[in-house]
């Protein structure tokens, strides 16, 4: 049957800076079609078990699927289709009126050059010197890739890394992010208690590991020289990192303009879209170049900050220069200055 499991089936993800996340488009019959999220009897707000799209991610040379659900911003320059039957089947599809279609979004992991362990080694006290030392990032709630608590395994000894705020460890963090195929270090994640109470409902593999490590050499260039084993601490911080390769990235759109290539910048926080407030850290055009690229438009023609005379104007704020560096957006509940961006339109 014609479905995304067919070996010749072609899909692509558009409207994002990454080939591994975006609006799902499929090749069917005589061209590319955007898939509506109302397909297969779903509601336009329904999120799916992403594992059902693993074949699509695989074919795009991406990692495992992270999310499958409404893309929330719908661009419909070409045809859009609603499909019926089983999820992932394209045997029975019909063209949809563009204004009725909410596009389907898919986020897959960025491809990894080497695959870090997907499950933790069993806790044991017998070292296995033959197994190479390795790292794993355990995602915190929110499940982001390339963000979380660092765990180090030497043989089958594994545990978290004790971390003191005064430790000068920038080189080490860059080394760790790089080793995890996650780019470079962005920042430490908020304090995580190593000795936190175990949730009785938490699965066994997420319980605290039996040993802990301490930073031994913050300028190390191979993993075996970075840490030494210590007695597990009952309290204190553990090393939790955010690396530049984190996913999913913040999505942006331009609204209120005469085309999809101009308008007030909005960003998505979870399922909600809101205006992006002007930030002093983004005075250059770099941020807007990135926004234009995400809309699949040309480079920035102009951008202007709109006056925020209204004390009740609200929005979201990114403290970094580029949106792709924003792990989380901050709410601004007053005096949000919106930004109107005009990008070059590739199809004027």
């Amino acid at each position: 049957r014609l479905s995304w499991y067919d070996p010749d089936f072609q899909a692509r993800l558009t409207r994002s800076n990454s080939k591994c996340q975006g609006q799902l488009e499929v090749y069917l019959k005589d061209g590319w079609h955007m898939v509506c999220s109302q397909s297969w009897g779903r509601s336009s707000k329904q999120w799916e078990d992403p594992s059902q799209a693993s074949k699509v991610c695989q074919r795009l040379n991406c990692g495992v699927p992270l999310s499958l659900g409404p893309f929330l911003v719908t661009y419909t320059p070409q045809s859009s289709i609603i499909c019926y039957g089983q999820l992932g089947s394209f045997s029975n599809c019909s063209h949809s009126r563009n204004d009725m279609c909410h596009s389907l979004g898919l986020t897959c992991l960025e491809p990894q050059k080497t695959t870090p362990p997907t499950t933790r080694p069993p806790p044991t006290t017998t070292p296995e010197p033959t197994a190479p030392p390795r790292l794993q990032l355990v995602a915190q709630s929110g499940g982001q890739h390339c963000a979380g608590v660092v765990e180090f395994y030497s043989g089958s000894l594994g545990g978290t890394i004790s971390y003191e705020a005064q430790d000068k460890t920038q080189d080490l963090e860059n080394f760790l992010c790089n080793n995890l195929q996650c780019g470079s270090f962005l920042k430490h994640l908020p304090e995580t208690e190593a000795g936190r109470a175990q949730d009785p409902g938490e699965p066994r593999e997420h319980q605290p590991l039996p040993i802990q490590w301490k930073i031994q050499n913050s300028s190390c260039t191979s993993l075996e020289h970075c840490f030494r084993k210590i007695k597990p601490q009952k309290s204190g911080r553990v090393l939790a990192l955010l690396c530049s390769g984190f996913q999913p990235k913040v999505q942006s759109r331009l609204v209120g303009g005469s085309s999809i290539c101009e308008g007030t910048v909005e960003v998505r926080q979870g399922a909600q879209w809101a205006a992006l407030c002007d930030s002093s850290s983004a005075r250059s055009s770099l941020r807007w170049e990135e926004v234009c690229r995400e809309q699949q438009c040309g480079s920035v023609n102009s951008y202007r900050v709109l006056d925020a005379g209204d004390p009740t104007s609200r929005g979201l704020f990114c403290p970094h220069q580029k949106l792709s560096q924003c792990h989380e957006l901050w709410e601004r509940n007053s005096y949000c200055k919106k930004v109107f961006v005009t990008c070059q339109d590739p199809n004027p």
């Epitope: 049957r1 014609l2 010749d8 072609q10 692509r12 090749y27 019959k29 005589d30 061209g31 029975n92």
Partner: antibody, heavy 120, light 106 residues
Amino acid sequence: EVQLVESGGGVVQPGRSLRLSCTFSGFSLSTSGMGVGWIRQAPGKGLEWVAHIWWDDDVYYNPSLKSRLTITKDASTDTVYMELSSLRSEDTAVYYCVRRRATGTGFDYWGQGTLVTVSS
Amino acid sequence: NIVMTQSPSSLSASVGDRVTITCQASQDVGTAVAWYQQKPDQSPKLLIYWTSTRHTGVPDRFTGSGSGTDFTLTISSLQPEDIATYFCHQYNSYNTFGSGTKLEIK
């Protein structure tokens, strides 16, 4: 084994209509993802896509020929028909029946072709 | 309509030569490109689809590459049975073909 056989070619006068048939075997147009269409080749010239019909009765026509073209299928007899009206001399060509899959794998099987000559 | 400009229109090569035929699309067609071989008095045969995927039974001396607007068909070591006319085909938006490249043996 996939096979497509065209029939209905010959000499036709300008202004008249023409109906070509394509009978196929080795696959079914009731199978989702399958399509059958027509491509023509003027003597000594290149290839021009004419029309296509899919398993679900969806049809696609070459925009420059659309006003004169009709493509239909009879899934029960594994036959596709193409009717071209108001024939002119530039419609003289070998007309090939082709199979195509909806996943975009090219025109993967071709008939041997039938020659249509438009002449008074 | 998307125009596919194929070059050269004809070429002469020796057995064992590496032969390259190119096609340029008038606008971005992604990777939705196929290549066909047509021998004299025969119907065309599909060689390659989605730019680089060989059709069943096609020898591995035929390879396709490219994306966007520029595409190439390469025959790594020309054989006598490869004498034919080769056509490119874009199917990103409807279907259009290149004008063909006639390949002869020196």
